[in-house]
């Protein structure tokens, strides 16, 4: 009686259950009555990553200089390669095809989060008390000068893009 | 079971080709590579390529390469194997086998190359 | 010129045990684990009697049996036989698609 379904890693063909490859290893032939399934290595830059009965290995994935992108993680017969971004950029989407400059937070926001290689720069508001007078990548908001610590008194209040002015206290004579 | 039945043999001019027909049954044609192989007489085992014929990739001996042609005709199970600008020495019995491994062979075709 | 190397010949009575060997390099042989053996009886076409360096198709017989080390594959015939008079080839994958074949071994049973 020959059989309907498989075991798991193994598939139908022609009445018989034969194992699937590897991965890493590509399908050359179906198993036969006499042989077992036939199953060659992946080249060289080239990957399977499940059980498989593919023909044909799958191409690593080319981290493309001319789109910022860079090898994070190498490519093995079994994984494809990870590209990542250049230093100061991030990718575009989960698949890391392309990658665009880190945004910059103008004066007036700071850094909430710095970006990394797939993921862009988070900015906010500098709240009460805070500024950030420069466009960056990288620069927090950063509280108002105290002038009370230094024994100084506000002459110019601050906001949300330029810091307190402090000056002398007024003496009365 | 596999069968491979090969074409019968020929004869050629120097200079002419000799097209090599392997027919297959058993199986599922797409489902399996053909190798072929040749041997001259007296001597030893020659492989000269492959052909995958589920998408019909090739991959050829470096020895080979441009001289030999391998296709196939899915609707006839057929794989063929092209060798051209023939000389003395190509002389021999070609055979197309199954897979890498080649778990099963043609009959064989000779060829003779003779002016 | 060969790219594995068989020797030539080799010769045993029957009922003893005859070993040939097929050296590869580091690339083909020592690379991967998809050595064959064939044999081959006069006028006919070879025969797999073992694959993926120690396998035996169904229906060949445990006398036949291999091995490897580094760059050279083993096939041991034990028990010999007169049937087994043949002519005995090794081959190899050799990466990229590519199969490389052992010169051959003329196998005598002496006697």
């Known amino acids: 009686e020959p059989p309907t379904a498989c075991r798991e890693k193994q598939y139908l063909i022609n009445s018989q259950c034969c194992s699937l490859c590897q991965p890493g290893q590509k399908l050359v032939s179906d198993c036969t009555e006499f042989t077992e399934t036939e199953c060659l290595p992946c080249g060289e830059s080239e990957f399977l990553d499940t059980w498989n009965r593919e023909t044909h290995c799958h191409q690593h994935k080319y981290c493309d200089p001319n789109l910022g992108l860079r090898v994070q993680q190498k490519g093995t017969s079994e994984t494809d390669t990870i590209c990542t971004c250049e230093e100061g950029w991030h990718c575009t989407s989960e698949a890391c095809e392309s990658c665009v400059l880190h945004r910059s937070c103008s004066p007036g926001f700071g850094v909430k989060q710095i970006a990394t290689g797939v993921s862009d720069t988070i900015c906010e508001p500098c709240p009460v008390g805070f500024f950030s007078n420069v466009s960056s990548a990288f620069e927090k908001c950063h509280p108002w000068t105290s002038c009370e610590t230094k024994d100084l008194v506000v002459q110019q209040a601050g906001t949300n893009k330029t810091d307190v002015v402090c000056g002398p206290q007024d003496r009365l004579r | 079971q596999v069968q491979l039945v090969q074409s019968g043999a020929e004869v050629k001019k120097p200079g002419s080709s000799v097209k090599v027909s392997c027919k297959a049954s058993?199986?599922?044609?797409?489902?399996?590579?053909i190798s072929w192989v040749r041997q001259a007489p007296g001597q030893g085992l020659e492989w000269m390529g492959m052909?995958?014929?589920?998408?019909?990739?090739?991959s050829y001996a470096q020895k080979f390469q441009g001289r030999v042609t391998m296709t196939r005709d899915t609707s006839t199970s057929t794989v063929y194997m092209e060798l051209s600008s023939l000389r003395p020495e190509d002389t021999a019995v070609y055979y197309c086998?199954?897979?890498?491994?080649?778990?099963?062979w043609g009959q064989g075709t000779l060829v003779t190359v003779s002016s | 010129q060969s790219a594995l190397t068989q020797p030539p010949s080799a010769s045993g009575s029957p009922g003893q045990s005859v070993t040939i060997s097929c050296t590869g390099t580091?690339?083909?042989?020592?690379?991967?684990?998809?050595v064959s053996w064939y044999q081959q009886h006069p006028g006919n076409a070879p025969k797999l009697i073992i694959y993926?360096?120690?396998k035996r198709p169904s229906g060949i017989p445990d006398r036949f049996s291999a091995s490897k080390s580094g760059n050279t594959a083993s096939l041991t015939v034990s028990g010999l036989q007169a049937d087994d008079e043949a002519d005995y080839y090794c081959?190899?994958?050799?990466?990229?698609?590519?199969?490389?074949f052992g010169g051959g071994t003329k196998l005598t049973v002496l006697g």
């Open positions: 086998a199954r897979g890498f491994r080649m778990d099963q």
């Open positions: 058993g199986g599922t044609f797409s489902s399996y590579a």
């Open positions: 052909i995958n014929p589920s998408g019909g990739t090739t």
């Open positions: 580091s690339s083909d042989v020592g690379a991967y684990n998809f």
């Open positions: 993926d360096v120690r």
């Open positions: 081959s190899s994958y050799a990466g990229n698609n590519r199969l490389v």
